[in-house]
Interface confidence: low
């Protein structure tokens, strides 16, 4: 807590200018008002306070609004904002988009802090729902942020909003995440053509179902083996020698670099040796010539 | 009382997955952060990541991404960390903790900790 | 990732002695930093937030100390009761990061 002390004669402060940097942290506290430094605050970021002068600035704004400051205010913060603990930003009501991004610009290209964190879920709680222009916002300064949402947080995202995401967003989701964004990204992306729907679709196929994998395989769409490798296990066991050699096209040879690595692994015990003799790759683990193989899912489905 | 009580100490394979609880309890669960701490021998506190209950939203230190993902079920008031494919690295001391904004953003409450042993 | 150095691993001390513990940060991290206390078979309690507030209650002969990057944790009148590890810790930014802990032992 900053002294109160009068301010000396002639120093009070007519603006936030340059000449302030030169006052000592009690000049600050005693000639700066803080209705002028809360009209002014578009200034502070041209300014170079120093850390501790910085704290002097804040001291006097949370005196002027110890509930919480204005959107007015909020949105000229800037570097002022990393001075900010979670506590402050909890009593915010942010809701422009702009000074979301103008906050967020503040500590890019640095790891989330605690406050941007809290920042980011007063404003999405806020808007009751992650709506495209948001979405983009995030991503772009945070790629892995669609990835740290829950299942069901991500069930609220619409469709539209899949416009948004880069396929350096899904970097790290996982299959649970993925179920739940393939649907509304097939949505997004159904009126576009085969090869155009592919380019957008491929980083969503993590959770791609069987018989979406097999509508691909007639659309010589090519699959590269890192696609391949991310799509869910259980989706790729029904698919045939020949639907997989149509997915992947030219780039089916690295199969034979995956063979211990699940899907291609598991795939491999599925299929017939010959059927994957066919292949050329010296697939070795399928199912030997003669052996009679049992559809158990079929036989319960009868059952 | 606050209280965070985790799940019991576990014994388990090379290779496999491992889920430890941490139930809240005396406080409104949503309303605070959890994290997850490793404590390992001869090693100091290693902050593995953060959820936040209200969203499930998390963020994981680098390190332990992959390695640890982050759940909660607020009907029970529980958070959950799930380990895979464990190796004997992961032999350690794990703690939930709470992470209270009003006091800086500092863990203020933690639970018993759950020793997890990775051998086979 | 800011990196939290504690010097000094172990430190001798009697009953009723001065300790400090000291704490040194990689950057600048302000005053979010808060120092735990943990004794074996128990987990790690709040002593200090904000780098120098006690948190309830907690003895007032714990005091935090420092800003920026050099941060201590004062014992004033050692009791037997606070043989322990001390860890320091900064909430300035992700990932939050522990100093190693000091091990405070009787003479």
């Known amino acids: 807590e900053v002294e109160k002390t009068a301010c000396p004669s002639g120093k009070k402060a007519r603006e936030i200018d340059e000449s302030l940097i030169f006052y000592k942290k009690w000049e600050l506290e005693a000639c700066v008002d803080a209705a002028l430094l809360a009209t002014q605050m578009d200034r502070v970021n041209a300014i170079p306070f120093t850390y501790e002068q910085l704290d002097v600035l804040k001291h006097k704004l949370d005196e002027l609004y110890p509930q919480g400051y204005p959107e007015s205010v909020i949105q000229h913060l800037g570097y002022l904002f990393l001075k900010m603990s979670p506590e402050d930003i909890r009593k915010w009501n942010v809701t422009s988009l702009e000074t979301l991004k103008a906050l967020l610009e503040v500590n890019k290209g640095h790891e989330m802090s605690p406050q941007v964190a809290t920042l980011i879920d007063r404003f999405v709680k806020g808007r009751g729902q992650l709506d495209k222009d948001t979405l983009d916002t995030l991503t772009a300064f945070y790629p892995g942020y669609l990835c740290s949402l829950s299942p069901e947080e991500l069930s609220s995202v619409p469709p539209s909003s899949i416009w948004a995401v880069r396929p350096q967003d899904l970097d790290t989701c996982d299959p649970r995440q993925l179920d739940v964004l393939y649907p509304k990204a097939r949505l997004a992306f159904q009126n576009m053509n085969g090869s155009e729907y592919f380019v957008k679709i491929q980083s969503f196929l993590g959770g791609a179902p069987t018989e979406d994998l097999k509508a691909l395989s007639q659309q010589n769409v090519s699959m590269d083996l890192a696609t391949f490798m991310k799509l869910r296990t259980d989706a790729v066991l029904p698919l045939t020698v020949a639907e997989v050699q149509k997915l992947l096209g030219p780039h089916v040879e690295g199969l034979k670099a995956e063979e211990r690595h699940r899907p291609v692994r598991d795939w491999i015990l599925r299929q017939r040796q010959d059927d994957l003799d066919t292949l050329g790759l010296g697939l070795q683990g399928g199912i030997p010539n003669g052996y009679l193989v049992l559809d158990l899912s079929m036989q319960e489905a009868l059952s | 009382e606050f209280q965070l009580q985790q799940s019991g100490p576990e014994l388990v394979k090379p290779g496999a997955s491992v889920k430890i609880s941490c139930k809240a309890s005396?406080?409104?669960?949503?309303?605070?952060?959890m994290n997850w701490v490793k404590l390992s021998n001869g090693k100091s506190l290693e902050w593995i990541g953060v959820?936040?209950?209200?969203?499930?939203?998390?963020s994981y230190n680098q390190k332990f991404k992959g390695k640890a993902t982050l759940t909660v079920d607020q009907s029970s008031s529980t958070a959950y960390m799930q380990l895979n494919s464990l190796t004997s690295e992961d032999s350690a001391v794990y703690y939930c903790?709470?992470?209270?904004?009003?006091?800086?953003?500092?863990?203020?409450?933690w639970g018993q900790g759950t020793t997890l042993t990775v051998s086979s | 990732d800011i990196v939290m150095t504690q010097s000094q691993k172990f430190m001798s001390t009697t009953v009723g002695d001065r300790v400090s513990i000291t704490c040194k940060a990689s950057?600048?991290?302000?005053?979010?930093v808060a120092w735990y206390q943990q004794k074996p078979g128990q987990s790690p309690k709040l002593l200090i937030y904000?780098?120098?507030n006690r948190y309830t209650g907690v003895p007032d002969r714990f005091t935090g100390s420092g800003s920026g990057t050099d941060f201590i944790l004062t014992i004033s009148n050692m009791q037997s009761e606070d043989l322990a590890d001390y860890f320091c810790?900064?909430?300035?930014?992700?990932?939050?990061?522990f100093g190693a802990g000091t091990k405070l032992e009787l003479k």
């Open positions: 950057q600048n991290v302000g005053t979010a």
């Open positions: 005396g406080y409104s669960f949503t309303d605070y952060n």
């Open positions: 904000s780098a120098s």
């Open positions: 903790a709470r992470w209270d904004n009003y006091y800086g953003s500092s863990l203020d409450y």
């Open positions: 810790q900064q909430y300035s930014s992700y990932p939050l990061t």
């Open positions: 959820i936040i209950p209200n969203y499930g939203t998390s």
